[in-house]
Amino acid sequence: AFGISGVQKYTRALHDSSITGISPITEYLASLSTYNDQSITFALEDESYEIYVEDLKKDEKKDKVLLSYYESQHPSNESGDGVDGKMLMVTLSPTKDFWLHANNKEHSVELHKCEKPLPDQAFFVLHNMHSNCVSFECKTDPGVFIGVKDNHLALIKVDSSENLCTENILFKLSET
């Protein structure tokens, strides 16, 4: 886990509301775990951050992630330039100035130090329709989700509607 206090002392002040020129509608500090209750942890190695999926020891503290939720207008296909509703997107930041980032070329999920405004690769469309879990779909690559592969996070292509329920793209959010 990060050996820095910022992850536990997150405040709104650390993330001003200039991200992509819009303010998050809400922010939430939570631990992230898989459908099978493995924890997502972040470690500093050789001056870069690695993301792991692992079982924690009984009293080991879970790493927290700041989830910032944004709404974007969803254009209506039927009504020309009208608006259907909203797409709920999220950015995930485990420590100040670092965000989860989709690397579509490598099919990987990485932690990048990003300048604001954040790039589209840092935004994920939120799904919440299965087993009170959430899924994170790449804004830049629809149909591709953050998932678990070989004890790491990876980008996983979901082909059919049934596969949206596949356990390796489902995550749990917890305040504890």
Partner: antibody, heavy 122, light 107 residues
Amino acid sequence: EVQLVESGGGLVQPGGSLRLSCAASGFTFSSYVMSWVRQAPGKGLEWVSSISGNGGSTNYADSVKGRFTISRDNSKNTLFLEMNSLRAEDTAVYYCAKSLGTTTTFLGFDYWGQGTLVTVSS
Amino acid sequence: DIQMTQSPSSVSASVGDRVTITCRASQGISSWLAWYQQKPGKAPKLLIYAASSLQSGVPSRFSGSGSGTYFTLTISSLQPEDFATYYCQQANSFPLTFGGGTKVEIK
């Protein structure tokens, strides 16, 4: 203009079945989570069921699980609720509702139909 | 399941009054709370989503606040068309649940 029009309600005996339909127009139906919410006469609102835009994920209230089935036909912009083994306590106005968010119920329901009354009585 | 407790169950008020309705969740729901207005014989209407975001077309006299387990809906200056029943709804987890409703009546 978004429109949701329910149909299929009526009087049915306990143990009977009904199929409710909700015809949607004015928005990209297949992009949105859709739900059924009911309201017993003189009572409050009760969520019944939700279905994802592609139909791959569904959720149900415990009170209807195993008896009701939600489905959708995106080619016809129609939402369904198949209701079996109906009980007196299922008597209510049933509303079809569109989620404000495309892929999530986190933002609530921004459009509702006018409702269709289901009466379960012998 | 998450229980939503609304109070008061009814309130008598006059045009121009400030009205506040509260909603408590039995466990934390972040900011995933919606408020609806319902008039007799009509479908509910979304007023507020994500605890404090005003739905398009809703007058600015309506406002929402709160997070976690405690939320409020405030009508800053009650208008004749605001006499109705108001419901909160937690949108955080399934099963989705509504509060019991607050009826705003004419004093």
